[in-house]
Structures are given as structure tokens and as C-alpha cells.
Interface confidence: low
């Protein structure tokens, strides 16, 4: 028997369901009584789900996994993982044994989009050209860690005097805070882009300083 899985990682959004595809080519006359199917975590060998002795032995992994019982006889050994969490990320191995055995590993990449950044200024009044200001760009509840880019109104990257911190919450999702320290010109726009590298999702925020007062562009 030869096991086949997707070469590319399965990307799943947090709190959605994911299918880890695994298939084999059953010989004519194959019956489920001959099948031993085991899903396990590749690195730790922890049992995730199994089908042995002609029946589904159920989930051994926080009761969030399921097989596709009606499709097993056709060679579909895929695993459904419900309500995906950050901690589910990693490699899963599908073992199929009929008379001989084979196995293959599939990777699960978990992702969560970042929120539209909120922008804050300090100080936020009595601003004059030549003043040093601190602009903070905050985006929340994303995964994995973000890439943050700053640009001025002409689209020129701002790389100096930028400090970015990312903190994971109890669910493993990241809150991003990026601080730009800049000397004000007569006026100017400063934009922050928070990119999720897995989803290729960009979240934009900007602030425009035109002497007085400050304006925050509406959400697009």
C-alpha cells in the first residue's frame, strides 16, 4: 500500500476546521476489517486518531478529530480537525497498514488575520515642525508573528527609530505594537503595514499630521 498526502502545508484559520488529506489505493476485494489506520503527531508520536479492528477507535486528541468513515473503503484516510488552535500546528503522520504498511507526514500551518491597526500619537497636541513624536501602531489577535513596515507619505520606507514588540495571549495569538519615533516636518502622513506572512494579508493604518488638528483617515 502506498500512502499519499499533500506536499504543501495545510493552512487553517484559528477556530475553523481543517482537513489533513491522506489517501491510499485499495486493492480489489479490500475491506475495512483489513485496515489499520493511525494518525499521530510526527515529532512526539502522540496518538491523534485511529481506526483498527474494523472500527473507528475515536479521537485521542482533545475530542476534536474525526475520520470520513464512508470514504475509508475508497482509500480516503483523511483526518478532520475541528476548531483549530494555535497549539495544533505541526506535522501529522498518517500510517496505513493493510498487509504491508506505509506512512507519510502532512504539515498543518495555523494562521489568524491581524486586525486593522489603530494609530496613536504622543504627544497628540500642540505639535510643531521639529517636534519629536511617537506614533504607535497596534494590531491584534493574529498568528503567526507579523512583519511590520512603516512608510512616509511618499512611500519611502522608514526603518530607523522603529521598535516593534509582539506578545502572545493565552490562545497563542499575537498582539503587535510598533512604535515609530520621528521628527515632524511641516506636515506628513505616516503609515504602518502589518503583514501576516502565511496568509499574505496586509492590514494598513495611517495618520496624517497637517499642523493642527491631526486627522486620521477613515477606514477604507
Amino acid at each position: 500500500v502506498e500512502v499519499q498526502v499533500s506536499e504543501d502545508p495545510v493552512v487553517a484559520l484559528v477556530d475553523t476546521d481543517a482537513t489533513l488529506r491522506c489517501s491510499f489505493s485499495p486493492e480489489p476485494g479490500f475491506s475495512l476489517a483489513q485496515l489499520n489506520l493511525i494518525w499521530q503527531l510526527t515529532d512526539t508520536k502522540q496518538l491523534v486518531h485511529s481506526f483498527t479492528e474494523g472500527r473507528d477507535q475515536g479521537s485521542a486528541y482533545s475530542n476534536r478529530t474525526a475520520l470520513f468513515p464512508d470514504l475509508l473503503v475508497q482509500g480516503n484516510a483523511s483526518l478532520r480537525l475541528q476548531r483549530v488552535r494555535v497549539t495544533d500546528e505541526g506535522s501529522y503522520t498518517c500510517f496505513v497498514s493493510i498487509q504491508d504498511f506505509d506512512s507519510a507526514a502532512v504539515s498543518l500551518q495555523v494562521a489568524a488575520p491581524y486586525s486593522k491597526p489603530s494609530m496613536t500619537l504622543e504627544p497628540n497636541k500642540d505639535l510643531r515642525p521639529g517636534n519629536m513624536v511617537t506614533i504607535t501602531c497596534s494590531s491584534y489577535q493574529g498568528y503567526p508573528e507579523a512583519e511590520v513596515f512603516w512608510k512616509d507619505g511618499q512611500g519611502v520606507p522608514l526603518t530607523g527609530n522603529v521598535t516593534t514588540s509582539q506578545m502572545a495571549n493565552e490562545r497563542g495569538l499575537f498582539d503587535v505594537h510598533s512604535v515609530l519615533r520621528v521628527v515632524l516636518g511641516a506636515n506628513g502622513t505616516y503609515s504602518c503595514l502589518v503583514r501576516n506572512p502565511v496568509l499574505q494579508q496586509d492590514a494598513h493604518g495611517s495618520v496624517t499630521i497637517t499642523g493642527q488638528p491631526l486627522t486620521f483617515p477613515p477606514e477604507a
Epitope: E2, V3, Q4, S6, E7, D8, S25, D100, F101, D102, S103, A104, A105
Partner: antibody, heavy 116, light 111 residues
Amino acid sequence: EVQLLESGGGLVQPGGSLRLSCAASGFTFSSYGMSWVRQAPGKGLEWVSGIYSGGSSKYYADSVKGRFTISRDNSKNTLYLQMNSLRAEDTAVYYCAKNRLRFDYWGQGTLVTVSS
Amino acid sequence: QSVLTQPPSASGTPGQRVTISCTGSSSNIGSNSVTWYQQLPGTAPKLLIYSDSHRPSGVPDRFSGSKSGTSASLAISGLRSEDEADYYCGTWDASLNAYVFGGGTKLTVLG
């Protein structure tokens, strides 16, 4: 009876290209991964490339990555190996083999000679 | 230099038992099943042993395979002159994302 028949080999100059074909019969071609394995004159076996049954996922040996492309046409029961930028060290008998992780049937091979 | 290491040659007289070793690492033999191939002179390779120790139909039970840790072995008992051939081990290497072969062992049947 499973049969694999390679074709497309021959003499080619360094830097040239060749396309090998492997016609399969006697099994459900679309259900199985397929592979190419080569053997230089007087040398051992060297795996070249493998492809999943549907054709979406492909693997290559480092020595051919970026130069060779494996593909398949399940409607024609045929496996292909497009070889570009050929080098003298690519000279070998090229075998088509059934499966991706265990080569249970092999063709008789086609000889590729790269020489000026 | 092959990823899997085999002795370049082995020999025995008819009726003897010979063993061919294949040594790898945790990323290949240690984590995937081993296959053995026989290549008779002037012919294409043939599947001899799969999944470490299983024989396809048509392969005599004089051929047997085993695996322990990161090494595998092919044993041929009751050696015959028609067993004179090159023998290769092979498996998938998870680190290289590639199938790897041993360098091959040339078996000579003496006398």
C-alpha cells in the same frame, strides 16, 4: 500485466534538452505515484524525481532541481521527464518506475547520452 | 558518496547464507520503511523486499529482510548461481525530501 515503456532517449549536446516519456499499462495509472530513476554507466542507482498520483506534488533530487521537470497525463497513462540544460554527468539509463516510495515495477530504461 | 552505506561487494558459495547491510540515519532508515532491489546483469532493477521485510509474490523465501534502528539487512540463504547480481537498498529521506539509494553491493557466487 504491468508494463512501463520509456522512450525519448538519445544523444544530445551539453546545454541541450530532451523529453522522456513513459507509457504505462496494466494498472490504474491515475491511482499511483510515479518516479524516474537513473543509472550512469557502471554506476549505482540514483533517484531523479517523483510525482504524486494527481500530479500536483513533485519532488526532485538536488542534482536536477531547476533543470528537470516531471509531469504526467493521466488521460494518456503517460509519465514525462523534461530535461533542460543537460550536462555530461546526466548521461545514464533513465528508468520509469511505478510508485513513489517503493518501486515495484520498472521499465527497461532509455539511454540518454550527453556529449559534444 | 551515497546517503545509505552498503558494502561494495559480497560473496559466497552455493548453498551458503550471505548478508548485505545497509546503514543510514534517523531521517531515512530510522523513520521510513526500507526496500531492497535486485539488478541482474544487463537488466532493469526488480523489487525484492519492501516495507523492511515483506516479499512480493514470486520472490523466493530464501530472501529475507530485517531492520533495526537506522540499519537494515538483506539475507540470502541457500545461495544459487542465479543470485549473482547487484543489490540496492532504498528509502525516503525526510530531511532531504528525496528518495535515497545505497551505493549497491555486487554479490558474487563462487565456484
